[in-house]
């Protein structure tokens, strides 16, 4: 089975992930290739091989260890164990099973400091499944009147997903119809004329644009949705940058 990982290369690649540095240039650990770490959520069919990578540098060369759900990950914790390729900063698990689901954290340390990065593994049984959305997306946003804003929804679906961006609206001063269902306006949906449906861009916003924006994703199995709030501030008030929150779990199904 194909390797499922943040990069498509195997461990014979020539990228210089293993960095040796001059002793006089001592340095705490740092990531050398964050692009290979961007994909935090790995939804993988059972029986596939999974590879997580945390390419790092530092002086002296840091050590790497792996945690599963915050605890030391031992070989005996899974049938067949796992491989760690230190020179490629990787963890490899072959033929994953549902009990492999969880958060995998690489801990990279030397005497000057430590850094860590967490991946979430979801093992999908070999049957069709509903869409999965990356947690924390779309993220809450704020901007001033006249500003631009972008919401992003990261979707994993091995069946064709239909993506909709929806906003709650009012009709005759009411948010709900006679059937008790909310009034909704579809702002964008995936289709022939819609490019990059995972992104909703709003330009020159007004106070009327404030509110909740829902990313709703459907395939023939089911649906998933997550929402974010847009705060529109008066022109003289600068937006406050929201602190980045690491949500757990990393997906919604």
């Amino acid at each position: 089975d194909a390797i499922s990982s943040g990069d498509d290369e195997d461990d014979t690649d020539s990228s210089e992930d293993f960095v040796s540095e001059n002793r006089s240039n001592q340095r705490a650990p740092y990531w050398t290739n964050t692009e290979k770490m961007e994909k935090r959520l790995h939804a993988v069919p059972a029986a596939n091989t999974v590879k997580f990578r945390c390419p790092a540098g530092g002086n002296p060369t840091p050590t790497m260890r792996w945690l599963k759900n915050g605890k030391e990950f031992k070989q005996e914790h899974r049938i067949g164990g796992y491989k760690v390729r230190n020179q490629h900063w990787s963890l490899i698990m072959e033929s994953v099973v549902p009990s492999d689901k969880g958060n995998y954290t690489c801990l990279v340390e030397n005497e000057y400091g430590s850094i860590n990065h967490t991946y979430h593994l979801d093992v999908v049984e070999r049957s069709p499944h509903r869409p999965i959305l990356q947690a924390g997306l779309p993220a809450n946003a704020s901007t001033v009147v006249g500003g631009d804003v972008e919401f992003v929804c990261k979707v994993y679906s091995d069946a064709q997903p239909h993506i909709q961006w929806i906003k709650h609206v009012e009709k005759n001063g009411s948010k709900y119809g006679p059937d008790g269902l909310p009034y909704l306006k579809v702002l964008k949906h995936s289709g022939i004329n819609s490019s990059n449906a995972e992104v909703l861009a709003l330009f020159n916003v007004t106070e009327m644009d404030a509110g909740e924006y829902i990313c709703k994703v459907s395939n023939y199995i089911g649906q998933a949705n997550q929402s974010a709030w847009l705060t529109v501030l008066p022109k003289q008030q600068a937006p406050v940058r929201e602190k980045e929150i690491t949500a757990s779990p990393d997906y919604l199904e």
Partner: antibody, heavy 113, light 106 residues
Framework: EVQLVQSGAEVKKPGASVKVSCKAS????????MHWVRQAPGQGLEWMGA????????NYNQKFKGRVTLTRDTSISTAYMELSRLRSDDTAVYYC??????WGQGTTVTVSS | AIQLTQSPSSLSASVGDRVTITCSAS?????MSWYQQKPGKAPKLLIY???NLASGVPSRFSGSGSGTDFTLTISSLQPEDFATYYC?????????FGQGTKLEIK
């Protein structure tokens, strides 16, 4: 164990309506589309529409729009398909199907004067 | 609506034979599903998302293809495989099925 159990066979006259039920068990009924597919005698399969029980989202095959009504009762995990203004060519086995791989046993609807 | 055309419409083969059924779509698709149906029974899912074997389906069944051309292959026919096979697309509304391929004993 996932099961979809459909109501029994029906015989109807042209112009009448029929309502077929599909009771789901063994999974979270609200979290998956319930599709309806029919098969006329000796013919192939035809998708009629689907309902998402959680929020009542519905997608219809335009061929049946105006004649088919899909509903559900989440309290008893049951989906319904009602077909109105029946014609003789509506004689078919009607199936409910969910999660891509689970099907009801089929309900035979015969339209005859 | 996307039309799916299966070929052949019927096929005679013997136990142990390798059999291939094709499904041609009128527009490009990302994925295809395949079902087996026996007389008086509901369809049974064999392959989903073009090449994934459904739970409990023997490994002699396989699916492949992309765009407009998809294939179901049975590597070595068994007596229980004689049935009608349908392709289906779940990508675009209205969802559609092929007309079916009847696989009979030679």
């Amino acid at each position: 164990e996932v099961q979809l159990v459909q109501s029994g066979a029906e015989v109807k006259k042209p112009g009448a309506s029929v309502k077929v039920s599909c009771k789901a068990s063994g999974y979270t009924f609200t979290n998956y589309w319930m599709h309806w597919v029919r098969q006329a005698p000796g013919q192939g399969l035809e998708w009629m529409g689907a309902i998402y029980p959680e929020n009542r989202d519905i997608n219809y095959n335009q061929k049946f729009k105006g004649r088919v009504t899909l509903t559900r009762d989440t309290s008893i995990s049951t989906a319904y398909m009602e077909l109105s203004r029946l014609r003789s060519d509506d004689t078919a086995v009607y199936y409910c199907t969910s999660r891509g791989d689970y099907w009801g046993q089929g309900t035979t609807v015969t339209v005859s004067s | 609506a996307i039309q799916l055309t299966q070929s052949p419409s019927s096929l005679s083969a013997s136990v142990g034979d390798r059999v291939t059924i094709t499904c041609s779509a009128s527009s490009g698709l990302s994925y295809m599903s395949w079902y087996q149906q026996k007389p008086g029974k509901a369809p049974k899912l064999l392959i989903y998302d073009t090449s994934n074997l459904a739970s409990g389906v023997p490994s002699r069944f396989s699916g492949s293809g992309s765009g407009t051309d998809f294939t179901l292959t049975i590597s070595s026919l068994q007596p229980e495989d004689f049935a009608t096979y349908y392709c289906q697309q779940w990508s675009s509304y209205p969802y559609t099925f092929g007309q079916g391929t009847k696989l009979e004993i030679k």
